[in-house]
């Protein structure tokens, strides 16, 4: 999906006003310096980009973050502020759904989550130079 | 341009009803999503309920579900508040506020729909004031 027509402001909206709260309650009980952001942005499409591959594709040692609360309403914001997001994804989700793991909370998730959070900040800050 | 204008305030006994009003005008009514907001002095400004005009859907704060009910009347370009029960907590300034694609999208609105900042366009404010 090519995010260049989404409402950058409305997902900032969102993000700040729900999504950040429970990525934040997500990682609770972890230091915010335990973790290196490795993964980086240079816009916000390419952010966006970022942000649903982390969020959710399966990685090894991180089954699906995709029925946490922040990753549900990643989801929603995607399909009411990205115009076309939602038929793109009608296909992946009947996938995910044959795939679906009980939620277990590993090093791993947690590692991807503060990533995740990384690259949502970066989004919010878009005139930054790339570091 | 794009107007929204409340109407329906006053002051009421505890345990009344009032009925607000929102007309709108200058943009595709059935497209939009229209949600009432309150603001107490003192207060932040919160989301009291929400509708979608493409199909019906409505979401209420818990602090006001089963008093108030949202309607909408796509052929008036009206979107209607009947509050019942009022309580002395319910004194406040009441906006409406429209936003372009939650109403096309309402099953994915009900995580945002509370949120003022998400929304395009405000109107001026009728005040409710409920007496004990």
């Known amino acids: 999906y090519d995010f260049t027509n989404c409402d950058f402001e409305k997902i900032k909206a969102a993000y700040l006003s729900t999504i950040s709260k429970d990525l934040i309650t997500y990682m609770s009980g972890t230091k915010s310096t335990e973790f290196n952001n490795t993964v980086s942005c240079s816009n916000r499409p390419h952010c966006l980009t970022e942000i649903q591959s982390l969020t959710f594709n399966p990685t090894a040692g991180c089954a699906s973050l995709a029925k946490e609360m922040f990753a549900m309403k990643t989801k929603a914001a995607l399909a009411i502020w990205c115009p076309g997001y939602s038929e793109t994804q009608i296909n992946a989700t009947q996938a995910m759904k044959k795939r679906r793991k009980r939620k277990v909370t590993t090093n791993k998730c947690l590692e991807q989550v503060s990533q995740l959070q990384g690259l949502w900040r970066r989004f919010n800050r878009p005139l930054l130079k790339q570091q | 341009q794009v107007q929204l204008v409340e109407s329906g305030g006053g002051l009421v006994q505890a345990g009344g009803s009032l009925r607000l009003s929102c007309a709108a005008s200058g943009f595709i009514f059935d497209d939009y999503a229209i949600a009432w907001f309150r603001q107490a002095p003192g207060k932040e400004r919160e989301g009291v309920s929400f509708i979608s005009n493409s199909d019906g859907t409505a979401y209420y704060a818990d602090s006001v579900k089963g008093r108030f009910t949202i309607s909408s009347d796509n052929a008036k370009n009206t979107v209607y508040l009947q509050m019942d029960s009022l309580k002395p907590d319910d004194t406040a300034d009441y906006y409406c506020?429209?936003?372009?694609?939650?109403?096309?999208?309402?099953?994915?609105?009900?995580?945002?729909?509370?949120?003022?900042?998400?929304?395009?366009?405000w109107g001026q404010g009728t005040q409710v004031t409920v007496s004990s």
């Open positions: 506020a429209a936003e372009g694609r939650m109403g096309t999208h309402s099953r994915d609105s009900v995580y945002f729909w509370a949120f003022s900042a998400l929304y395009d366009y």
